[in-house]
Amino acid sequence: ARARNGDHCPLGPGRCCRLHTVRASLEDLGWADWVLSPREVQVTMCIGACPSQFRAANRHAQIKTSLHRLKPDTVPAPCCVPASYNPMVLIQKTDTGVSLQTYDDLLAKDCHCI
């Protein structure tokens, strides 16, 4: 079971691990040579700090938090990463024309600390 402790950010609003959206063009993403559409993507990603027990993904993340407090030089704090993803379909260039391809790990759906 996921021990998703604490959705209250002690660092202040918007400072802790959360979903963030950035509008990006195919050129920004480096996809222009193989993707035709969409020409712009609302990229959802996970950003922010992971203070003690905030959105801990599992017990390992809780242990990591505790050890980071004791040994910050050797144990890093948990990282804010996607907990799940939204699928996305792209129209791609192929040798013979164009095709559809679906990707299940491009866009973050929600975030946690691990």
């Epitope: 035709l36 559409s37 020409r39 939204n86 379909v89």
Partner: antibody, heavy 119, light 110 residues
Framework: EVQLVQSGAEVKKPGESLKISCKGS????????IGWVRQMPGKGLEWMGV????????IYSPSFQGQVTISADKSISTAYLQWSSLKASDTAMYYC????????????WGQGTLVTVSS | QSVLTQPPSVSGAPGQRVTISCSGS????????VNWYQQLPGTAPKLLIY???NRPSGVPDRFSGSKSGTSASLAITGLQAEDEADYYC??????????FGGGTKLTVLG
């Protein structure tokens, strides 16, 4: 309010040509793909193909490749589905539908255009 | 023959809970998402659930979706007369792109 308004019902003879339309409003027409879906009488939904109205890229279901042509005119926010030679088996309700942001589902649908092909 | 398999019909009395199944394979539901559409008699389909378990705004929380392995389910609780409709699941298949189930006719008894 997002709306997709399709052209009216058509009655045609086998061998005739036809072009039906789907006009989008209430959103940026070039920012969302448009798909076409067939529903034969008393049957289920079948995906026919998709167009990106911004770049006019089209991709067809293998079942409909070469049978129909999908196009769009972004200047009037309209997508089209056309046949060069209709068959009786083309008799069906045809729906246009807008794709959601990630291209994985259809979030808005037109009211449908009934095409009847009979001699 | 649809790539996704649904029961042709299900029924339930008002207030009851009913589920509609959608069975696929490792090339569609098994690795990707499922969406559900409701088609009321004589009308166009309407998006009911997307990406397995998300409801668009305006869809009552009586409707919920889930996915496990190569199958998905649509659950309707507190069944109402106006829920009588055809329900379609839809996913992605590596060979034929967007695929629909054959549809399930929901009858509200009484």
């Amino acid at each position: 309010e997002v709306q997709l308004v399709q052209s009216g019902a058509e009655v045609k003879k086998p061998g005739e040509s036809l072009k039906i339309s789907c006009k989008g409003s209430g959103y940026s027409f070039t920012s969302y793909w448009i798909g076409w879906v067939r529903q034969m009488p008393g049957k289920g939904l079948e995906w026919m193909g998709v167009i990106d109205p911004g770049g006019s890229y089209t991709i067809y279901s293998p079942s409909f490749q070469g049978q129909v042509t999908i196009s769009a005119d972004k200047s009037i926010s309209t997508a089209y589905l056309q046949w060069s030679s209709l068959k009786a088996s083309d008799t069906a309700m045809y729906y246009c539908a807008r794709y959601g942001r990630y291209g994985t589902y259809f979030d808005y649908w037109g009211q449908g255009t009934l095409v009847t092909v009979s001699s | 023959q649809s790539v996704l398999t649904q029961p042709p019909s299900v029924s339930g009395a008002p207030g009851q809970r009913v589920t509609i199944s959608c069975s696929g394979s490792s090339s569609n539901i098994g690795v990707l998402y499922v969406n559900w559409y409701q088609q009321l008699p004589g009308t166009a389909p309407k998006l009911l659930i997307y990406s397995n378990d998300n409801r668009p705004s305006g869809v009552p929380d009586r409707f919920s979706g889930s996915k496990s392995g190569t199958s998905a389910s649509l659950a309707i609780t507190g069944l109402q007369a106006e829920d009588e409709a055809d329900y379609y699941c839809q996913s992605w298949d590596s060979s034929s792109n967007y695929v629909f189930g054959g549809g399930t006719k929901l009858t509200v008894l009484g």
